[in-house]
């Protein structure tokens, strides 16, 4: 039930990606607002994004305090012009989110290869380890801190001159790998946690191949 | 429940082709990687290789390089493994299985390839 | 390619014995070493990840150690549905490979 004049949002869609997390809704607006709250499951209900007329509210700042609780979200509406009108329950119309917990459902983003060196018949790949906006003691997390060993990285190599691939593992962000001497090679990287059920990889980092800048050979 | 049930196998004369299926049930491959593995009678497990079914990449044991072709349809939920030039030597059970990346946690029953002419 | 050496191939024990099968690697493969049990006609089942980590259903009877190029799957008290095939597989670089197998029998 509510007000003739406002309608419910719907489709509430939780969009994360290295816990940049947004939340989505519809309809757009026709003469009314929306404001967003969210909480934790045992917590307080905190207000975001107050009577605005886009249909999406960053909620980063908020679950980032604790990436492994399961946060709830709701999207309230409001005629325009006439916020305190509530609907006939005596209360605000509002839809609750899906939950959401931002360490087992964020998307993982896709990787950056960082570096590779040649020496020899071994070549260190190194991917990037991405800022995230998770906080501790006022200094910003990368992935890698955040994960630990819950995040892999797979590499996919092959020579230039071939389309056969291979693969290797590793928990670190570095992988050192045995190549041919003489043969260029490209790379590409993802990152994988396994223990996810949903969500679990990422796309497949752009390729890099030696003989390019980013890479350095010493004999 | 995760099911993974593998099709397609049978007798195939030397020199022959085969496409087996591996149906999969109560996950979405697109977020696993999935493998093909063969056991000769009586012998071990042998690699054959694997496939993102989500960014379609695809490794294969050197050895089957040549010969081996993995594919999957995501809208059917499906592995598949071709395998050209059969011979008597490529006669084993071959087993399809989900892999997290830590490890291999469901495989199939297995599908019997026998090559003979 | 990475070679993975299983030791022994077989062996007679009794319901209750210690039984430990070993697995050892031609490099290192940095702990990306996974146990499987297989019985006759079935397909294998996963038992150890990552070298020490015990799979989801398993008895903690079974146990992983080792680093480095060398492994260790440990059955503490053997009981009769632990009569079978044991290998040992290496998954941190393609190809993925798998040691000969060790057939644990009645003695």
């Known amino acids: 039930s509510g007000t003739t004049n406002t309608v419910a949002a719907y489709n509430l869609t939780w969009k994360s990606t290295n816990f940049k997390t947004i939340l989505e809704w519809e309809p757009k607006p026709v003469n009314q607002v929306y404001t967003v709250q969210i909480s934790t499951k045992s917590g307080d209900w905190k207000s975001k994004c107050f009577y605005t007329t886009d249909t999406e509210c960053d909620l980063t700042d908020e679950i980032v305090k604790d990436v492994k609780q399961t946060y709830l979200a709701r999207v309230f509406s409001y005629p325009a012009g006439n916020v305190e009108s509530t609907g006939s329950a005596g209360e605000p119309l509002y839809e609750n989110s899906p939950e959401f917990t931002p360490y087992l459902e964020t998307n993982l983003g896709q990787p950056t290869i960082q570096s590779f060196e040649q020496v020899g018949t071994k070549v260190n790949v190194t991917v990037e380890d991405e800022r995230t906006l998770v906080r501790r003691n006022n200094t910003f997390l990368s992935l890698r801190d955040v994960f630990g060993k819950d995040l892999i990285y797979t590499l996919y190599y092959w020579k230039s001159s071939s389309s056969g691939k291979k693969t290797a593992k590793t928990n670190t962000n570095e992988f050192l790998i045995d190549v041919d001497k003489g043969e260029n090679y490209c790379f590409s990287v993802q990152a994988v946690i396994p223990s996810r059920t949903v969500n679990r990889k990422s796309t497949d980092s752009p390729v890099e191949c030696m003989g390019q800048e980013k890479g350095e050979f010493r004999e | 429940e995760v099911q993974l049930v593998e099709s397609g196998g049978g007798l195939v004369q030397p020199g022959g082709s085969l496409r087996l299926s591996c149906a999969a049930s109560?996950?979405?491959?697109?977020?696993?990687?999935m493998h093909w593995w063969r056991q000769a009678p009586g012998k071990g497990l042998e690699w054959v290789g694997l496939i993102d079914p989500e960014q379609g990449n695809t490794i294969y044991d050197p050895k089957f390089q040549d010969r081996a072709t993995i594919s999957a349809d995501n809208s059917k939920n499906t592995a598949y493994l071709q395998m050209n030039s059969l011979r008597a030597e490529d006669t084993a059970v071959y087993y399809c299985?989900?892999?997290?990346?830590?490890?291999?946690?469901?495989l199939g029953q297995g599908t019997l390839v026998t090559v003979s002419s | 390619d990475i070679q993975m050496t299983q030791s022994p191939s077989s062996l007679s024990a009794s319901v209750g014995d210690r039984v430990t099968i070993t697995c050892r690697a031609s490099r290192d493969i940095k702990s990306y070493l996974n146990w499987y049990q297989q019985k006759p006609g079935k397909a294998p089942k996963v038992l150890i990840y990552?070298?020490?980590s015990l799979a989801e259903g398993v008895p903690s009877r079974f146990s992983g150690s080792g680093s480095g190029t060398d492994y260790t799957l440990t059955i503490s008290s053997l009981q009769p549905e632990d009569f079978a095939t044991y290998y040992c597989l290496q998954h941190g670089e393609s190809p993925w490979t798998a040691g000969q197998g060790t057939k644990v029998e009645i003695k």
């Open positions: 109560g996950f979405n491959i697109k977020e696993y990687y």
């Open positions: 299985a989900r892999d997290t990346a830590a490890y291999w946690d469901y």
């Open positions: 990552y070298a020490t």
